[in-house]
Interface confidence: low
């Protein structure tokens, strides 16, 4: 919450769009602004009504450089927008840098997402430390058509204005907690030395030398990928990362989607009966796919499944007697994740040498 807890003393707020941006039509700007206010009205007793003339509570303007409020913009990128806390005059007003490229899609910068953040300030919210929150300071793309206000922001707005008037109180997505003892990963992979742990619409990224871990939206790095990825692996020889969900898979070179993706897993030789892959890892020219209690082995050079597969997971990896959620390769180990624990399988000694909590990888002691 903003220091001093400024708030509007009435709940039926008005807004006025003073001018527009050349990159979007008037209708597109109007829709983005309406949708941005709707995010907050659903979660609170506040209502927002557009007026076309007269004095509004919240004035919305596209301006550039020095525009008379002692907070100049700086041209493309950098400062995208700013808004003033509730109050008379300039209070509540939201200014958008007219030199930015404003969009309706995943290209920088999506007007709805930035406006929804700024209107949080207009209503009295300050920045959040929750990386999944709308009020987190860093811009991150999220799909507008399915956007739901995160729980952290719902808590914030309801602390100021009380609960929504809706008979069914809204609940929003919560950011996964790294140190949740029940945390389980959807997928893991390495990528050029770093380790990625996927969960819902997020991933944690761990730097191997620094041991630092940061949490990001999948859409921030890869707007074209779906949430809820199920498996991933790095092909070291081709410098590609493959990610799977259902029967589809994507290939990335660094952070760029390869052409021709997504593809169907039938390209690997999977039959129609296989509807999803639990986990995957590539090592020494072979890729191991884990599906239920079985392991399939694919030859990366011949581009076909090896004969005699699938085999049971315990027959190939003694001590791994469970369904595998995620796996990656590090040194001479396969790290298998199952539920809230992981198994370190040494493929030199061919045995499990450690079982521990999965979120040790996220620096949770």
């Amino acid at each position: 919450l903003t220091p001093g807890s400024p708030k509007w003393t009435h709940t039926n707020l008005t807004y006025r769009i003073i001018n527009h941006t050349p990159q979007l039509s008037r209708a597109e700007v109007k829709t983005a602004i309406e949708k941005a206010f709707h995010v907050w009205s659903v979660a609170s007793p506040l209502t927002f009504t557009e007026i076309l003339q007269g004095e509004a509570d919240i004035n919305i303007a596209f301006v550039s450089r020095d525009h008379g409020d002692n907070s100049p913009f700086d041209g493309p990128n950098g400062i995208l927008a700013h808004a003033f806390q509730p109050g008379q005059g300039i209070g509540g007003d939201a200014h958008f840098d007219s030199e930015e490229t404003w969009t309706q899609d995943s290209k920088n910068y999506n007007l709805f997402l930035v406006a929804a953040h700024e209107f949080g300030h207009s209503l009295g919210l300050s920045h959040s430390t929750d990386p999944g929150a709308l009020m987190y300071p860093n811009y991150a793309y999220r799909e507008p058509s399915t956007y739901s206000l995160p729980q952290d922001d719902i808590n914030g707005i309801q602390t100021i204005y009380g609960p929504s008037d809706n008979p069914i109180q809204p609940t929003g997505p919560s950011t996964p907690k790294a140190c949740d003892p029940h945390l389980r990963f959807d997928a893991t992979t390495t990528l050029r030395g770093e380790i990625y742990f996927f969960k819902d619409k997020y991933f944690w990224r761990r730097h191997p030398q620094l041991r630092t871990v940061d949490l990001n939206f999948i859409s921030l790095f890869w707007p074209f990928l779906p949430n809820g990825l199920q498996a991933a692996y790095e092909d070291f020889d081709r410098d590609l990362v493959f990610l799977f969900k259902g029967r589809q898979y994507w290939a990335l070179s660094g952070y760029d989607l390869q052409q021709g993706y997504p593809r169907d897993i039938s390209n690997y030789g999977f039959p129609r009966s296989v509807q999803a892959i639990d986990a995957a890892v590539s090592y020494n020219g072979k890729t191991y796919f884990f599906i239920n209690n079985q392991c399939w082995r694919y030859d990366n050079q011949r581009r076909s499944m090896d004969p005699g597969y699938p085999k049971s997971i315990p027959s190939m990896f003694p001590g791994v007697n469970c369904r595998v959620d995620a796996v990656f390769l590090q040194d001479s180990f396969f790290l298998f994740f199952s539920g809230p624990q992981y198994f370190a399988f040494n493929f030199v000694s061919h045995r499990v040498t450690r079982v521990a909590r999965s979120n040790l990888w996220l620096n949770c002691s």
């Epitope: 990128n77 400062i79 300071p137 860093n138 811009y139």
Partner: nanobody
Framework: QVQLQESGGGLVQPGGSLRLSCTAP????????IGWFRQAPGKERERVSC????????NYADSVKGRFTISRDNAKNTVYLQMNSLKPEDTGVYYC??????????????WGQGTQVTVSS
Amino acid sequence: QVQLQESGGGLVQPGGSLRLSCTAPGFTLDYYNIGWFRQAPGKERERVSCISSSGGSTNYADSVKGRFTISRDNAKNTVYLQMNSLKPEDTGVYYCAHCMATTEGYEYDYWGQGTQVTVSS
């Protein structure tokens, strides 16, 4: 912490040029927005320029526009700042850092140690 390393600073006459380089041994820069910042004696550190991870988007302080050019070579894991038509007021310690676009401006972390640029006749 990621250790960025700057190089290329030195003493140059007004109107001269320098090219600064920023690398991060053992760390991949290619998906970070990287920026150059400078600090003159007794003054606040100020942003000079930032470049997006792909290199497709750049941003300059008004005081260096048209004279400085930021670029990157992701294959070499290096970000450059080409400084032309240098002025005495460009003197200072130049740092590179990870810069993150936010709704309120740039935030920075992963500072380097800096390289001294002195413009004097």
